[in-house]
């Protein structure tokens, strides 16, 4: 601004936020996730950063283990407050198996449909949270390619808790969860030492999701 208050030049905003995303969070609910309220605390911290509404960001949640449950659809709630209340009530469904490919594929085929609230032309984001190698990993490569073909951006989070508790090597597990994440992996993959540490990645995860809105 000049001394006479005239605009002499302007700086374009770093990003223009359309604030429209369809986000489906795919949660591993098998028994080895412990304690479960670390997951609900993570959800709370992540969701409260979002501007949720039918013309803004929409969020759906899918829980998987031995089978898959739609906890709520993208169009179920129309405000952040409503989603926070619902997310807090999600109970762990248990099971010994971790059918990650099934969880992701169900989210792609069912959660991201118009019938469940997905909007045409709105960017699709999937956040996958798991703590173990999948029991259906032979299907994973195809399932991930199907997501790619439908332009679904994927963030994956590996919880190392059950491996650390059992003094097991995490190498194979981390590689699998990295393979789920979109490219570049370093911007789409996270790992945490245990369930309690999930809340420590919320800020970075949130920023990377919102960067997609540009």
């Amino acid at each position: 601004v000049s001394p006479t208050f005239q605009v002499v030049n302007s700086i374009a905003p770093v990003q223009e936020c359309s604030t429209q995303l369809d986000i489906v969070i795919v949660l591993d609910g098998s028994n080895s996730i412990y304690p479960w309220d670390s997951v609900t605390a993570f959800l709370n911290d992540l969701l409260e950063r979002m501007d949720i509404g039918p013309k803004q960001t929409q969020v759906g949640i899918v829980q998987y283990g031995e089978n898959v449950t739609h906890e709520f659809n993208l169009n179920k709630y129309s405000s952040t407050e409503e989603v926070l209340v619902a997310a807090k009530k999600i109970v762990q469904r248990g099971g010994r198996q971790t059918m990650t490919a099934l969880g992701i594929d169900t989210a792609r085929k069912e959660a991201f449909t118009e019938a469940r609230g997905a909007r045409r032309g709105v960017k699709k984001v999937m956040v996958i949270v798991t703590d173990g190698e999948s029991h259906d990993n032979h299907r994973l490569k195809k399932v991930i390619q199907d997501c790619e073909d439908e332009n679904i951006q994927r963030f994956s989070i590996a919880i190392l808790g059950s491996y650390n508790r059992g003094n097991l090597s995490t190498e194979k597990f981390v590689e699998e969860i990295k393979s789920i994440a979109s490219e570049p992996t370093e911007k789409h993959f996270f790992n945490v030492s245990d369930e309690l540490a999930l809340v420590t990645i919320v800020k970075a995860l949130g920023e990377r999701i919102f960067a997609l809105e540009a």
Epitope: N31, Y34, E66, G95, R96, S162, R165, N167, L168, D194
Partner: antibody
Framework: EVQLVQSGAEVKKPGESLRISCKGS????????IGWVRQMPGKGLEWMGI????????RYSPSFQGQVTISADKSISTAFLQWISLKASDTAMYYC??????????????????WGQGTLVTVS | EIVLTQSPGTLSLSPGERATLSCRAS???????LAWYQQKPAQAPRLLIY???RRATGIPDRFSGSGSGTDFTLTISRLEPEDFAVYYC?????????FGQGTTVEIK
């Protein structure tokens, strides 16, 4: 509502066999471990063992290994605790409890969030 | 096997007073995997606290847990008449579950 309902009190003679039960409802019973806990008269709590009804995988406390048998029938959402030959020292209250946690991959961990009302077993 | 020692054995207090119960482990309990249960006469135990400090669903906020390593504490900030009972700590960080011998909180 999660519930664990145990079978009724039993009075037995030494040397007799017995099976008590614990029926779960209000959740997917085959997807959670169920533990058994003993409480002798006027005493504290002792963990006996744990079972995963989905596939009947079972772990025992060393103190109870070979003394009791834990089993489950997932089709009726029920876990069982069984003795082949009871002793007077088996007189106690027995509780079943749902494990919020896991017992695989080389480690067991978790807390018992829901408990049955208890089954009193008297051997005399 | 991790041995848990609770103290005191009995605590005699009046309603409205603060109760502090201690649970000491014979070795470090990994990840703070310690729970507290309340048991009233002729009733099953009830979960109060897990992972050392997290209150179970429906447990009033006058109950709080703290501690790590080998020393853990259950505090009842203001005793209500219904809080007089036996309290057990339980560890679950060593691939088995062991309980303390219990602390009785009785009316003075």
């Amino acid at each position: 509502e999660v519930q664990l309902v145990q079978s009724g009190a039993e009075v037995k003679k030494p040397g007799e066999s017995l099976r008590i039960s614990c029926k779960g409802s209000g959740y997917s019973v085959s997807s959670y471990w169920i533990g058994w806990v003993r409480q002798m008269p006027g005493k504290g709590l002792e963990w006996m063992g744990i079972i995963y009804p989905g596939d009947s995988d079972t772990r025992y406390s060393p103190s109870f290994q070979g003394q009791v048998t834990i089993s489950a029938d997932k089709s009726i959402s029920t876990a069982f605790l069984q003795w082949i030959s009871l002793k007077a020292s088996d007189t106690a209250m027995y509780y079943c409890a749902r494990l919020q946690g896991d017992c695989s991959g080389g480690s067991c961990y978790g807390h018992f969030d829901y408990w049955g009302q208890g089954t009193l077993v008297t051997v005399s | 096997e991790i041995v848990l020692t609770q103290s005191p054995g009995t605590l005699s207090l009046s309603p409205g007073e603060r109760a502090t119960l201690s649970c000491r482990a014979s070795q470090t309990i990994s990840s703070g995997y310690l729970a507290w249960y309340q048991q009233k006469p002729a009733q099953a135990p009830r979960l109060l606290i897990y992972v050392a400090s997290r209150r179970a669903t429906g447990i009033p906020d006058r109950f709080s847990g703290s501690g790590s390593g080998t020393d853990f504490t259950l505090t009842i900030s203001r005793l209500e008449p219904e809080d007089f009972a036996v309290y057990y700590c339980q560890q679950y960080g060593s691939s088995s579950w062991t309980f303390g011998q219990g602390t009785t909180v009785e009316i003075k």
